[in-house]
Amino acid sequence: TSSASSSSSSAPFLASAASAQPPLPDQCPALCECSEAARTVKCVNRNLTEVPTDLPLYVRNLFLTGNQLAVLPAGAFARRPPLAELAALNLSGSRLDEVRGGAFEHLPSLRQLDLSHNPLAYLSPFAFSGSNASISAPSPLVELILNHIVPPDDKRQNRSFEGMVAAALVAGRALQGLHLLELASNHFLYLPRDVLAQLPSLRYLDLSNNSLVSLTYVSFRNLTHLESLHLEDNALKVLHNGTLAELQGLPHVRVFLDNNPWVCDCHMADMVTWLKQTGVVQGKDRLTCAFPEKMRNRVLLELNSADLDCDPILPPSLQTS
């Protein structure tokens, strides 16, 4: 093996020189750094426009961050022989705007995938399942990181972004083994109803820094393994009884609710009662009212029923213009 592609203890990462020779099984692609000892290839901030074809077979951790990939086609990582060891793939910040169906096919060991910070105008429903069958082969993915993948408004498709992401998560029930899902900073206004039902193995769910106003139609009931639920920095006004009961029924969960604009009126009474007795919410004494104005900054835990009133709704005949 040439010195440009072999690795030694004195130089654990070697930048590759472009070579006219046919690719060797353990060659390091141009514009990448490779360490066979660490089973790692880094092609970072190199303005790559496509995935290198000549990735070494030993690669277990592949970093393709900070590039200009634009489109990830079907079989983007399919090789002969396959990259059978590849377990962690980081594509964050690579200007991807389209991930097509089957993009991650033929990666039998892929456990962690990070697509964060890519403006995904199009995410195929079959991006993770690889096929359009109603039940596909289970994906090996255990961790899926999709933070800040929302495209700018002018690049959005007609359909809802929430719906597009949800379709990819539930297609073929391929992600039933997923333990970690990060969906932070995506401007989600709602969480499609059926998504969580298809992800029964989740242990960690991050929905922070979205625009979720309500969880009324979201069911957490079957997430019996859930350990962390991050709902900080959303637009939540109140959690209703159904949601409270579901969260209380999850045996291991810790819920994070900081920085939401809680509305402290009569509809908040059940949530306040629940907060006072639950051990589920982390940092619950940091939760404060945002509305109405007279209640701003009041600590939820310190409220009682007398504090939580609603202005009476006048019958139309008594309303003044």
Epitope: D285, A290, N297, V299
Partner: antibody
């Protein structure tokens, strides 16, 4: 109306400790966080930390851990900040304010001078 | 920690003028930004909370705007009592941090 009344100016020697107070009136004392803010002469504002009087909960700026300690007396609606092992750098005006997402009412400040 | 930067440390304007004071954060803070006024005698008051909401009792001559990392406070029809130092503050993440202040003087 909401008022935060702070204790008077203090002149202390290096190495000593001092306890500043902030008396709250005009609102439900245990229902709001109290914030503490430092301002060195001619400088800007620096957040020290916060306390929730009814529960004893505290959050400190890492920079002030070991320097500042918050306590409260809920029977008299007073929050205290103790500053220990005083140095010249602790000379400042210290403000208390009602928090948390915004500091909507402020005390008038307590001037602490540390001098040998 | 999130750094808050007020690039203009002092500003001179005439009575009746419109003045804009800017503030930038080292990372996005989701509109979690407040503005405070400190008078020469040391008195501190909240003016604007959550980027653009006017605190009760504050004249409507004051307004706030911004998003992401960039925010501003605007005062129209400047009056003598507006002579003060103005501070921005983020409450997105602990520790809460303030800008270095912008001192407003009357020309």
């Amino acid at each position: 109306q909401v008022q935060l009344q702070q204790s008077g100016a203090e002149l202390m020697k290096p190495g000593a400790s001092v306890k500043l107070s902030c008396k709250a009136t005009g609102y439900t004392f245990t229902g709001y966080w109290i914030e503490w803010v430092k301002q060195r002469p001619g400088q800007g504002l620096e957040w020290i930390g916060e306390t929730l009087p009814g529960r004893g909960s505290t959050n400190y700026n890492e920079k002030f851990k070991g320097k500042a300690t918050f306590t409260a007396d809920t029977s008299s609606n007073i929050v205290y900040m103790q500053l220990s092992s005083l140095t010249i750098e602790d000379s400042a005006i210290y403000y208390c304010a009602r928090g948390r997402r915004d500091f909507d009412y402020w005390g008038q400040g307590t001037t602490l001078t540390v001098s040998s | 920690d999130i750094q808050m930067t007020q690039t203009t440390s002092s500003l001179s304007a005439s009575l009746g003028d419109e003045v804009t004071i800017s503030c930038s954060a080292s990372q996005g803070i989701n509109n979690y930004l407040n503005w405070y006024q400190q008078k020469p005698d040391g008195t501190v008051k909240l003016l604007i909370y959550y980027t653009s909401s006017l605190h009760s009792g504050v004249p409507s001559r004051f307004s706030g705007s911004g998003s992401g990392t960039d925010y501003s406070l605007t005062i129209i029809n400047l009056e003598p009592e507006d002579i003060a130092t103005y501070y921005c503050q983020q409450f997105s993440k602990l520790p809460f941090t303030f800008g270095s202040g912008t001192k407003l003087e009357i020309r």
